[in-house]
């Protein structure tokens, strides 16, 4: 697994413990919390990052209207169960035996139940809508410049293939980034849109997950793009199953 050889660190995940105990004395990094080996040449899965975070010491409108089936992560942080590949297990339970089903980005998609709750498969989140509001600027950003800069960011910083950035919408002061990635489209080695969105979310909040890199300094033709509010909507390949009680 690629890691910085000289001082043995993980460039893509600072929530790791690294040591030169890999094959041939190579640097090997393990995620905090799970102890799982991570590939430092790419993004670490959101599940392992959440687990590491929980183990750390506590301190005409062009905009898209999210579908009625879109999920927002209202439950916040929890200590997830990850499978051997670092993906979320379909069923998550807490210490009091309350269980629920999640999608591939770890967001709850069913009502909470008990240990008898069945989650037959991990449902893939194939469409993510990132909704941002930026701080005042001297004028509106040029849409095409903004589009190009955000696509460049996802390609270069998060290593997300450009084909997965479906669209960038802008209606001052709201920016929307649409990420789309079906199961059939995702090839081996492709960064998952859920992981890219999570890294972006943490960057925007000033909580970069990258080792030693400065915070995100987003600029459009030299002008800073400063985000003051972020909302992320998740759409699954199979609509979520909530009781009507939750919807009222």
């Amino acid at each position: 697994h690629t890691a910085a050889q000289d001082n043995c660190t993980c460039p893509t995940n600072k929530m790791t413990v690294c040591s030169p105990d890999g094959p041939g004395g190579r640097c090997q990094c393990r995620a905090l919390g799970s102890g799982m080996a991570v590939d430092c040449s790419t993004l670490t899965s959101k599940c392992l990052l959440l687990k590491a975070r929980m183990s750390a010491p506590k301190n005409a409108r062009t905009l898209v209207r999210p579908s009625e089936h879109a999920l927002v992560d209202n439950d916040g942080l929890y200590d997830p169960d990850c499978d051997p590949e670092g993906r979320f297990k379909a069923r998550q339970c807490n210490q009091t035996s309350v269980c629920w089903c999640v999608n591939s980005v770890g967001v709850r998609r069913t009502d909470k139940g008990d240990l008898s709750l069945r989650c037959d498969e991990l449902v893939r989140t194939h469409h993510i809508l990132i909704d941002l509001r930026h701080r005042p600027t001297a004028g509106a950003f040029n849409h095409s410049d903004l589009d190009a800069e955000l696509r460049r960011l996802f390609r270069e910083r998060y290593r997300l293939h450009p084909k997965f950035v479906a669209a960038v919408h802008y209606e001052q002061p709201t920016i929307q980034i649409e990420l789309r990635q079906n199961t059939s489209q995702k090839a081996a080695g492709d960064v998952d849109i859920g992981d890219a969105a999570y890294y972006f979310e943490r960057d925007i909040k000033g909580e970069s997950l990258f080792q030693g890199r400065g915070g995100l300094d987003l600029r459009v033709r030299g002008e800073p793009l400063q985000v003051e509010r972020t909302l992320i909507y998740y759409l699954d390949e199979i609509p979520p199953k909530f009781s009507m009680k939750r919807l009222t």
């Epitope: 509001r133 701080r135 005042p136 600027t137 001297a138 004028g139 001052q172 002061p173 300094d217 600029r219 033709r221 030299g222 002008e223 800073p224 400063q226 003051e228």
Partner: antibody
Framework: AVTLDESGGGLQTPGGALSLVCKGS????????MGWVRQAPGKGLEYVAA???????GYGAAVKGRATISKDTGQSTVRLQLNNLRAEDTATYYC?????????????????WGHGTEVIVSS | ALALTQPSSVSANPGETVEITCSGG????????YGWYQQKAPGSAPVTVI????KRPSNIPSRFSGSTSGSTNTLTITGVQADDEAVYYC?????????FGAGTTLTVL
């Protein structure tokens, strides 16, 4: 600690030109908007000009067309050039730093001030 | 051009809570932005006590706080001290320029 040091004030003649310089230290100069605020004797604070980290500029109504704000990131300095001076430009001029890079909401974002330099326009 | 409205003076006894309001700032798509600046004597450098509505510089005591309700921002000084006696200016966003209020003189009795 953040420090802002102004220079260039003093006695000026009406119709002449003024050049004020502010040198910043203790912060990453290139990342923040900078600006000038003045206070005439016995009066309140007045916005003069600001420049964002990306070099977009804004000017107060009283100096628009007569003022130019610029910066030298390498030297960590911001300069205010004010032409066609009038008696009403007499004031203490303060250099101010924004807590952000953008310029449009500049006044509400000021998080640090210089000690000021006094400018007197008189014949 | 916009004009900020703030009271010309307020007074309080030491230990009391003081609130100074400021309204009339620019509306940036439904959001209003304000800052508060303390000046202890004319010609002395202002000191930022609150910027960006609620943010407090690290050198400012926690008794200073800012809050926004609609288009009005309120500077609250909890447990006012004699050293807080000063003129407080509010500042706000106005398109590509900035504006200040006329100042509120705080007298600590």
């Amino acid at each position: 600690a953040v420090t802002l040091d102004e220079s260039g004030g003093g006695l000026q003649t009406p119709g002449g030109a003024l050049s004020l310089v502010c040198k910043g230290s203790g912060f990453t100069f290139s990342s923040y908007a900078m600006g000038w605020v003045r206070q005439a004797p016995g009066k309140g604070l007045e916005y003069v000009a600001a420049i964002s980290s990306g070099s977009s500029t804004g000017y107060g109504a009283a100096v628009k067309g007569r003022a130019t704000i610029s910066k030298d990131t390498g030297q960590s300095t911001v300069r205010l050039q004010l032409n066609n001076l009038r008696a009403e430009d007499t004031a203490t001029y303060y250099c101010a730093k924004s807590g952000y890079g953008g310029s449009a909401s500049y006044v509400s974002d000021i998080d640090a001030w210089g000690h000021g330099t006094e400018v007197i326009v008189s014949s | 051009a916009l004009a900020l409205t703030q009271p010309s003076s307020v007074s309080a006894n030491p230990g009391e809570t003081v609130e100074i309001t400021c309204s009339g700032g620019g509306d940036y798509y439904g959001t209003y932005y304000y800052g508060w600046y303390q000046q202890k004597a004319p010609g002395s450098a202002p000191v930022t006590v609150i910027y960006d509505n609620t943010k407090r510089p690290s050198n400012i005591p926690s008794r200073f706080s800012g809050s926004t309700s609609g288009s009005t921002n309120t500077l609250t000084i909890t447990g006012v001290q004699a050293d807080d006696e000063a003129v407080y200016y509010c500042g706000s966003y106005d398109s590509s320029a900035g504006i200040f209020g006329a100042g509120t003189t705080l007298t600590v009795l």
